[in-house]
């Protein structure tokens, strides 16, 4: 058993049929010694008396808010949560496996630049009685500070018969140098509590590996005389690290119709303009990627050919 | 920026082309190592990230773009010594910091060159003959060092009398290649920045 936060405790249980469970001793936070009784949640049934209460925690029915009273007055609370371990593996029932970039990916993180600011998100099908708490640091043995905000519900989607909820959190490394060469990864820890179930999820990464620039901005087309070619130009996204001659991007320019199966014109360039062949009912799209360290491509920025 | 802005032109700043080749060569070598040593811990997640130049050179700090010198977090350990010879220097207006930056890059390359050559000598003794260093990568390191043209003491190649542990050598190779790739990225950024200046 360990303390998650004041008056909230996590009991770690090996979860299998007829498991013996865990013996837990609760102590009432009071100077009083006599006349103390214990109840669980809203029930008025007295579970025991005395300053301490010993319980055998085996299942979710044994978890919950234990309260000690004296003469009708509440003295203190202890909330017990369960953390299940099945076949030596901690349960991951609360969050959905996003399977990208690999299986057992529950947390996904991205950074728009090298400033030390990043966003992580996760998915769940649970809509109520759900809380998240996020901590982060650079390295684990001698951790350096990363400050994370509160996790918020950022999107709701319907997937078949199920509703899916996306939560996200923004974090900022306290003292980040965009030009630094990372040798210790960022660690992100998410505590998830659904009703009386506790789970924790972690992710470890280097900012350089989670870079995904915003799409290029201000796409413009200029038809070339006596030709089917157009010159397309664009600018670096505002959110990208500066100076751009140090933090350079490379670009992919593509002309394609509405269907992915349609024919296309595609060219890669380090410049902020390119010449392509435009077709009726097609659009020109441009995306960006760090020129020197190949992490993710940005989403496409598009303009119609016409 | 205190350096005049000019149109980027590979001919104007000879080291840019070499640094691009360097990044390409080390990336290819790392990819080859990851494929060949698939049953060894050779991915970014599996290895310890060590920097053999730590406390010996200060490339990141010495080569910091002027725009980032206002960022407190980037200024932990700025060096103040400088060296002013070097053929990549594009004009007489070149600042001392730029000379220090290029000499720091040169020292990095020299250190990695020695490590890689020592390691290759060990790998050549491996009866499995599983992996060797790409001669192209070693040549590209040499070309960039020649383009930088700094005079410095030659570092003797380390020779070891004991029987090499090939498993450890291959893991060390992965560690070295990962670190060198990161440094090659920095070098490429720096050359691109200087080329635009």
């Amino acid at each position: 058993i360990w303390e998650l936060k004041k008056d909230v405790y996590v009991v770690e249980l090996d979860w299998y049929p007829d498991a013996p469970g865990e013996m837990v001793v609760l102590t009432c936070d009071t100077p009083e010694e006599d006349g103390i009784t214990w109840t669980l949640d809203q029930s008025s049934e007295v579970l025991g008396s005395g300053k301490t209460l010993t319980i055998q925690v085996k299942e979710f029915g044994d978890a919950g808010q234990y309260t000690c009273h004296k003469g009708g007055e509440v003295l203190s609370h202890s909330l017990l949560l369960l953390h299940k371990k099945e076949d030596g593996i901690w349960s991951t029932d609360i969050l959905k496996d996003q399977k990208e970039p690999k299986n057992k990916t529950f947390l996904r993180c991205e950074a728009k630049n090298y400033s030390g600011r990043f966003t992580c998100w996760w998915l769940t099908t649970i809509s109520t009685d759900l809380t998240f708490s996020v901590k982060s640091s650079r390295g684990s043995s001698d951790p350096q500070g990363v400050t994370c905000g509160a996790a918020t519900l950022s999107a709701e989607r319907v997937r078949g018969d199920n509703k899916e909820y996306e939560y996200s959190v923004e974090c900022q490394e306290d003292s980040a140098c965009p030009a630094a060469e990372e040798s210790l990864p960022i660690e992100v820890m998410v505590d998830a509590v659904h009703k009386l179930k506790y789970e924790n999820y972690t992710s470890s990464f280097f900012i350089r590996d989670i870079i995904k620039p915003d799409p290029p901005k201000n796409l413009q087309l200029k038809p070339l005389k006596n030709s089917r070619q157009v010159e397309v130009s664009w600018e670096y996204p505002d959110t990208w690290s500066t100076p751009h001659s140090y933090f350079s991007l490379t670009f992919c320019v593509q002309v394609q119709g509405k269907s992915k199966r349609e024919k296309k014109d595609r060219v890669f360039t380090d410049k902020t303009s390119a010449t392509v062949i435009c077709r009726k009912n097609a659009s020109i799209s441009v995306r960006a990627q760090d020129r020197y360290y190949s992490s993710s491509w940005s989403e496409w920025a598009s303009v119609p050919c016409s | 920026r205190n350096l005049p802005v000019a149109t980027p032109d590979p001919g104007m700043f000879p080291c840019l082309h070499h640094s691009q080749n360097l990044l390409r060569a080390v990336s290819n070598m790392l990819q080859k190592a990851r494929q060949t040593l698939e049953f060894y811990p050779c991915t970014s997640e599996e290895i310890d990230h060590e920097d053999i130049t730590k406390d010996k050179t200060s490339t990141v700090e010495a080569c910091l773009p002027l725009e980032l010198t206002k960022n407190e977090s980037c200024l932990n350990s700025r060096e103040t010594s400088f060296i002013t010879n070097g053929s990549c220097l594009a004009s007489r207006k070149t600042s001392f910091m730029m000379a220090l930056c290029l000499s720091s890059i040169y020292e990095d390359l020299k250190m990695y060159q020695v490590e890689f050559k020592t390691m290759n000598a060990k790998l050549l003794m491996d009866p499995k003959r599983q992996i060797f260093l790409d001669q192209n990568m070693l040549a590209v390191i040499d070309e960039l060092m020649q383009a930088l043209n700094f005079n410095s003491e030659t570092v003797p190649q380390k020779s070891s009398l004991e029987e090499p542990d090939f498993y450890k050598t291959k893991i060390k190779l992965c560690i070295l290649l990962h670190a060198f790739r990161i440094r090659a990225v920095t070098i490429d950024r720096v050359m691109s920045y200087l080329n635009a200046s």
Partner: antibody
Amino acid sequence: QVQLVQSGAEVKKPGSSVKVSCKASGGTFSDYYLHWVRQAPGQGLEWMGWIDPENGDTEYAPKFQGRVTITADESTSTAYMELSSLRSEDTAVYYCARNKELRYFDVWGQGTLVTVSS
Amino acid sequence: DIVMTQSPLSLPVTPGEPASISCRASQSISINLHWYQQKPGQAPRLLIAFASQSISGVPSRFSGSGSGTDFTLTISSLQPEDFATYYCQQSNSFPLTFGQGTKVEIK
């Protein structure tokens, strides 16, 4: 299986024209760009131009501009390359090639040898 | 026009040994570079697109690298069927242009 089948070898007199055909099978004809590339005996490859069979748009290499015409007939899934004012240096194998990507070629015809000789 | 220069023009290799062919562009072409193999009396065959993207059906011993002006096609271990002429082609701008070809021959 996508295939491009070209017309047979031709012998032409200098100053005359030649029209080579390229019939496509497998896949929708208008879903691909179609190019013509030639190769003189013992020499390298030389790109001549492309056509978008969907709308008849064409683009030619400056070297052949005014002398080459590329057309396409969607009803028969056939593309044509006509080269006029032939000279001896036009003796070559002419290939048609296609791709959904405009700028490179993933399927090639077997080639048509055009000999220009007096 | 962008001029593509291949080297060497002839490359004698022992079967089973690796081979590398170089292609240089007269100006920067990013990764807009493709490689083809041509055997005598046959049409060219696409091996690599955009400098390093493998093509389905092409053996994994063929790999490409490079960007900007310098590109390399590598055959990790030459098989008897790999003796052929190899061409690079730039797609950065029209007109599309090819290298003059490298003939890989049995040593």
